[in-house]
């Protein structure tokens, strides 16, 4: 919306937000740090949802894909005041609530979840925000965490996928705008296309599914694609080889003309899935074509 | 199919103890947090206690704590409820119900513990 | 924490809509469950996070949750609709499940 890069990808984001006292003169630059990378992700298959934490978490905007409802949400946090203690886990559990919510429906999407704090978390709050961390992971969440200012990195590294799902921000509020591109570039999984997009019906063939972030897995072996075959049945498959920005994968044999298959990716063995536009269709192929 | 039944109710004393079970079958007992649920006579539901998938962690209702402890056998596929130092009020049907983040998407038929002199 | 207000009884003719209504100080910014139960029986979910239906519950079971209030509308109401319902929301795991005082659902 605002031009430079964009993610495309289709996943559910939950941005949890420390909203303790010692967050009180800095809420500005936390909201325009959300804002400006809420307008990134541009798919129509991404939904949203905004949670803050101090002495209890707060679901300010449950999870929707609605433009509009993703903009009164913005305004709702803008008007948030900081003030309690920092009680991580608790955001962390209010997002993996509606994962657990959302999972009951069948389809599993993906879910990505940035957490932002200023602090150290003493020795009860951190164990507590590892093991609800934990929690959403075991729920198929990719877990980011956003370091400000007072943070102990060792701390986020373990609340976090690894240290490589870090963000510090050494140099205080003010410089939360300076790792947008990162986050973003590190945080987003897309699916942007497959090649080829058109296939022989009753053939095997190879698909090139191109896209960014594929790498991110925790776990590089637990990447699928997936192809949801006429909106109704799922095939996965193991890709044979994952780069950052191209997966490699055995196609499903499509045996009639015309049938569709909506590619996805799973970053943790089919639990949850990331969706795309893209599509890849069957057509009659005469011998030697 | 998913069920859970629970037994161990009854009449009991004022100050005295009992000890409830909740047998579960049809699903992965240790994939899910439980829960102990209940009502009194012509009243509504109250929440007394919650247990994690692995029983690590333990949550009470202010009424309960420090009186009843939630535990579960996960080699057995049981729930249980012991309750401790028990009140008049502690009369009800006491439901175990398979949870999620507040969520009770299984119930059993539920057991009646009537303390009374 | 969060305390959830239910009206003791609603009346309703039936093949008409029904609303028994869940309030609670902004409500919106929790998810809302709803249980119907009927007399002798264990509770049995209808909907939860605010307007999912389980499977096996009938298509006339909804939900909404606006403001300080959720709302389960049964449209088309049935005689077998007649029950007691209980809205409840989950404030964490330190306060654990809040029900509502629970709704007799009369089916005139």
């Known amino acids: 919306e605002d031009g430079g890069p964009a993610c495309y990808g289709g996943f559910d984001l939950y941005f949890i937000l420390d909203k303790s006292g010692s967050v009180l003169h800095h809420w500005n630059e936390i909201y325009y740090f959300v804002e400006q990378l809420a307008h990134k992700f541009i798919s129509p298959q991404l939904r949203m949802s905004f949670i803050v934490f101090s002495t209890r978490g707060t679901t300010l905007m449950k999870l929707t894909e609605d433009r509009e409802q993703i903009r009164q949400g913005l305004e709702e946090l803008q008007k948030v005041l900081p003030g309690g203690d920092t009680y991580m886990h608790e955001g962390f559990e209010r997002a993996s609530e509606q994962i657990y919510y959302e999972n009951r429906q069948g389809y599993r999407t993906a879910s990505v979840i940035i957490a932002l704090t200023d602090g150290e978390l003493h020795e009860d709050l951190f164990f507590y925000s590892e093991r609800e961390a934990n929690r959403s992971r075991d729920l198929g969440a990719i877990v980011y965490c956003v370091g400000v200012k007072d943070f102990n990195e060792t701390q986020l590294a373990r609340i976090a996928d690894s240290k490589d799902h870090v963000f510090p921000v050494n140099d205080g509020f003010q410089a939360l705008q300076g790792i947008i591109h990162s986050i973003l570039k590190k945080s987003c999984i897309e699916i942007l296309a497959a090649e080829p997009s058109t296939i022989c019906a009753g053939e095997s063939f190879q698909v090139v599914v191109r896209g960014n972030g594929f790498r991110h897995a925790r776990n590089v072996d637990r990447v699928l694609c997936s192809f949801k075959i006429n909106d109704s049945v799922t095939l996965n498959e193991k890709p044979f080889s994952v780069e950052d920005t191209y997966l490699l994968c055995p196609a499903p044999i499509l045996k009639e003309v015309g049938m569709k298959a909506a590619l996805q990716v799973s970053m943790n063995d089919g639990l949850s899935f990331i969706s795309s536009s893209v599509i890849i269709t069957t057509t009659h192929c005469s011998d030697g074509s | 199919q998913v069920q859970l039944v629970e037994s161990g109710g009854g009449l009991v004393q004022p100050g005295g103890s009992l000890r409830l079970s909740c047998a579960a079958s049809g699903f992965t007992f240790n994939s899910y947090g439980l829960s102990w649920v209940r009502q009194a006579p012509g009243k509504g539901l109250e929440w007394v206690s919650n247990i994690s998938s692995n029983g690590s962690y333990t949550y009470y209702a202010d009424s309960v704590k420090g009186r009843f402890t939630i535990s579960r056998d996960n080699s057995k596929n049981t729930l249980y409820l012991q309750m401790n130092s028990l009140r008049a009020e502690d009369t009800a049907v006491y439901y175990c119900?398979?949870?999620?983040?507040?969520?009770?998407?299984?119930w059993g038929q539920g057991t009646l513990v009537t303390v009374s002199s | 924490d969060i305390e959830l207000t239910q009206p003791p009884s609603v009346s309703v003719a039936p093949g008409q809509t029904a609303r028994i209504s869940c309030s609670g100080d902004?409500?919106?910014?929790?998810?809302v469950h709803w249980y119907q139960q009927k007399p002798g029986q264990a509770p049995v979910l209808v909907i939860y996070?605010?307007?999912k239906r389980p499977s096996g519950i009938p298509e006339r079971f909804s939900g909404s949750n606006s403001g300080n209030t959720a709302t389960l509308t049964i449209s088309g109401t049935q005689a077998e609709d007649e029950a007691d319902y209980y809205c409840s929301s989950w404030a964490g795991s330190r306060s654990g499940t809040v029900f509502g005082g629970g709704t007799k659902l009369t089916v005139l």
């Open positions: 996070g605010d307007n």
């Open positions: 119900a398979r949870a999620g983040y507040g969520l009770f998407d299984v």
């Open positions: 902004k409500l919106r910014e929790y998810y």
